[in-house]
């Protein structure tokens, strides 16, 4: 019996169509994705395969102007209009509290959503129940099918969904409802979920009774045979792990910002075994066609987004300062609102000992493009936002060691003087230069705020201690030439959309003056 | 739980047809086929035929001419209709599941007079 | 037709021992190989499936590798419940048996 899974992943509010980066379509003739052209697609196979299940691991929440204004509601209604199966909760799904899951998509749904690791107690546990499930039987054909679901364990760290959810670990979670499954003689199981491919890789190993595993998080892209488009795949798809009870499981991912669609063919034995899977991501290029009544939806919709686009987000009683004259010689007054920003957004997870998770910011100077001038009534429009930051990015969290920071405030003025993008605006750092030095040895101080403690306060940068910083991906992928970020760092979570983060932070502080306060010397 | 349970004669006079039932219960036969497999008595395993999922059958091209696979998936039952017995015949005869996963428990058919 | 070579056809061995049995289709299978126990009894359970992963149940001293045309059995540790026939069984076509690998207590 075979099944065709087609899957989505980290799909960030790409609603439209993309450029081939994932950024905003320009050139329509060469872009990609969107929910019109997923649509034609998934229909294409509904119509050619006999059992068909449209899935999605997690974070549909976040990334566009879509999310900013919408807030869910727009993946609730085109994930029914695609008629998806079922999808897990990702950690972006909690970025509006748990009030902005459960509103705008849990109650609005028309299919299910699961996670077998989140369990919710206190006044939540009775507004939240049936909600989310750990897992649904879902029938295909002549044969059924079990769902459980995950989200990662860090969801506390990486977004907002308050007191009373705990998030325990996925396996854990996972080995009983798998086993609940197995006693209503549900023996294909695929788990769908969001924790990241390493994870998936855990649980296709140690969860006993998983068949298939189908994730996200981790954007990775997997490919057989020689890819179609730019991302490089980071083994073959499916990518099959030996379980520890000596079977061959599929892992499965489809890289992010629904510019693939997932395919993967599994064949059960009639004890539901996988007897053989293949496939590979088919790209949503242009070659596909919009179908045309979902376009119009999606253009239906777009007018609101049009108009919130010029509304004032707050105000600014100062100069913005974001020139690259500025910004990529010495800190700029747009660098640390940035980080502000950045830092405000992972406001989360304080206890008696870290009065935050995380301190820290840096920001490549080249990122920001524009300057905002206080003199047109100090207004400060998502239109604005969008020239300083144009390229569609994330503010990301990631774990480095000390050294390695070290070594990228080095990258920063290796080349000092020439205007290049990789001169660093902070946040929560002191650096001091002496540009008289040679390249590579020019860091002379290098304080950091901590965050183990009830007063914060600047302390000397530790070459062994790990710390968490939040940076933009384009960073945490080694652009600029920070490459040392990319091979050393330790841990990567995706963020929020870039200019969502400094629009909610305007938009909360109402009025802002930032200063340039000697983060750099 | 998955299963084949087989029934029939465990004796067949010489040119007369023998019929074996196998009853599957844990799975869906419009999902999965049936294979049908012989052991003559000290010697390998050999193919016989298959129903599939949708219905229609493939057979050894040894015995194409008087072997017959049917199935009620109502009733979960495949039928094997085999004619002309002849004493060579004489074998364990096994419904296995599609992938092999599965084995009935084997009906040894003597063919006599 | 796909023919399967299955070798050796019988062996003897003692309770420890790490035994192998190969076979050789004649034409590519592409992993759609399984091994077979019988019992002398005559019941007949898969071991292994698509070439190499385990039934659930099984032992794991038994593995199973190859790829194209070439396919190994392996038990790493021979156990007294282990004397029993082996077949390989090839599904990439109308399912072929390989002849068989007896294997005795030495």
């Known amino acids: 019996w075979e099944l065709t899974i087609l899957h989505t992943n980290d799909v960030h509010s790409r609603l439209e169509q993309t450029s081939e980066d994932s950024s905003k379509c320009v050139n329509a003739s060469r872009c990609m994705g969107g929910v019109a052209r997923l649509f034609t697609k998934v229909q294409q196979i509904r119509r050619a395969e006999p059992n068909v299940l449209l899935l999605d691991a997690g974070d549909q929440y976040q990334g566009t102007i879509w999310f900013t204004v919408y807030k869910g509601a727009e993946v609730a209604h085109f994930m029914n209009a695609l008629r998806y199966d079922a999808m897990a909760l990702g950690n972006h799904e909690f970025d509006n509290g748990v009030e902005g899951l459960i509103e705008p998509l849990l109650k609005e749904a028309k299919f299910p959503i699961l996670s077998a690791n989140i369990k919710a107690k206190g006044p939540l546990a009775s507004q939240i129940s049936g909600l989310y499930l750990p897992y649904k039987v879902l029938p295909v054909g002549d044969e059924v099918v079990g769902i459980v679901g995950y989200t990662s364990k860090e969801t506390p760290f990486l977004s907002n969904p308050g007191t009373n959810l705990v998030f325990e670990d996925e396996i854990t979670a996972l080995q009983p409802e798998v086993d609940k499954l197995k006693t209503l003689n549900v023996n294909k199981i695929i788990a769908l979920g969001h924790s990241g491919f390493e994870t998936d890789k855990l649980i296709a190993q140690k969860v006993r009774g998983v068949d298939v595993v189908v994730g996200g998080h981790s954007n990775t892209f997997l490919y057989t045979g020689n890819p179609p488009s730019k991302e490089v795949p980071a083994g073959k798809y499916p990518f099959i792990v030996t379980s520890d009870d000596g079977r061959k499981v599929p892992v499965v991912q489809a890289y992010a910002f629904g510019k693939y669609l997932g395919y993967l063919k599994i064949e059960f034995d009639e004890r539901g075994n996988v007897i053989s899977s293949h496939g590979n991501p088919i790209l949503l290029n242009s070659s596909i066609p919009e179908d045309p009544s979902i376009k119009a939806d999606i253009n239906k919709w777009r007018i609101k987004l049009d108009n919130y686009s010029t509304q004032e987000l707050g105000k600014t009683i100062v100069y913005l300062d974001g020139s690259s004259q500025s910004c990529r010689f010495r800190e700029c007054n747009m660098g640390n609102l940035i980080c502000d920003a950045m830092i405000n957004n992972n406001l989360r997870h304080a206890d008696e000992m870290f009065w935050n998770h995380v301190s820290m910011c840096i920001l490549n100077g080249g990122g920001i493009r524009s300057p905002i001038d206080e003199r047109n009534n100090g207004t400060i429009t998502w239109e604005n936002l969008a020239a300083v930051l144009p390229f569609g990015g994330t503010f990301d969290l990631v774990q480095l060691k000390g050294s390695t920071l070290k070594k990228a405030f080095e990258h920063s003025v290796h080349r000092y003087g020439q205007s290049t993008g990789e001169f660093l605006q902070v946040g929560g750092i002191h650096v001091v230069y002496d540009l008289s030095r040679k390249p590579g040895d020019r860091v002379v101080k290098l304080d950091v705020l901590c965050t183990k403690c009830r007063v914060p306060s600047y302390d000397p940068l530790k070459m062994d201690e790990i710390y968490k910083v939040i940076l933009p991906n384009f960073l945490a992928n080694g652009g600029d030439g920070f490459q040392m970020i990319k091979d050393e760092l330790l841990r990567h979570d995706s963020g929020d959309q870039d200019i969502n983060v400094v629009s909610t932070y305007i938009s909360k502080m109402k009025v802002i003056y930032p200063a340039v306060e000697g983060r750099i010397k | 739980e998955v299963t084949l349970k087989q029934s029939g004669p465990g004796l067949v006079k010489p040119t007369e047809t023998l019929t074996l039932t196998c009853t599957v219960s844990g799975f869906s036969l419009s999902s999965y086929g049936i294979q049908w497999v012989r052991q003559p008595p000290g010697k390998g395993l050999e193919w016989l035929g298959v129903?599939?999922?949708?219905?229609?059958?493939d057979y050894n091209a040894a015995f194409i001419s008087r072997l017959t696979i049917s199935k009620d998936t109502s009733k979960s039952q495949v039928v094997l209709t085999m004619t002309n017995m002849d004493p060579v015949d004489t074998a364990t005869y096994y419904c296995?599941?599609?992938?092999?996963?599965?084995w009935g428990q084997g009906t040894l058919v003597t063919v006599s007079s | 037709d796909i023919q399967m070579t299955q070798s050796p056809s019988s062996l003897s061995a003692s309770v420890g021992d790490r035994v192998t049995i190969t076979c050789r289709a004649s034409q590519d299978i592409g992993d759609r190989l399984n091994w077979l126990q019988q019992k002398p009894g005559g019941a007949i359970k898969r071991l292994i499936y698509?070439?190499?992963s385990l039934d659930s149940g099984v032992p794991k001293r038994f593995s199973g590798s190859g790829s194209g045309t070439e396919y190994t059995l392996t038990i790493s540790s021979l156990q007294p419940e282990d004397f029993a026939t082996y077949y390989c069984?090839?599904?990439?076509?109308?399912?072929?048996f390989g002849g068989g690998t007896k294997v005795e207590i030495k």
């Open positions: 296995a599941g599609q992938y092999g996963s599965v």
């Open positions: 069984l090839q599904y990439a076509g109308s399912w072929t």
């Open positions: 129903i599939w999922s949708g219905g229609s059958a």
């Open positions: 698509a070439t190499s």
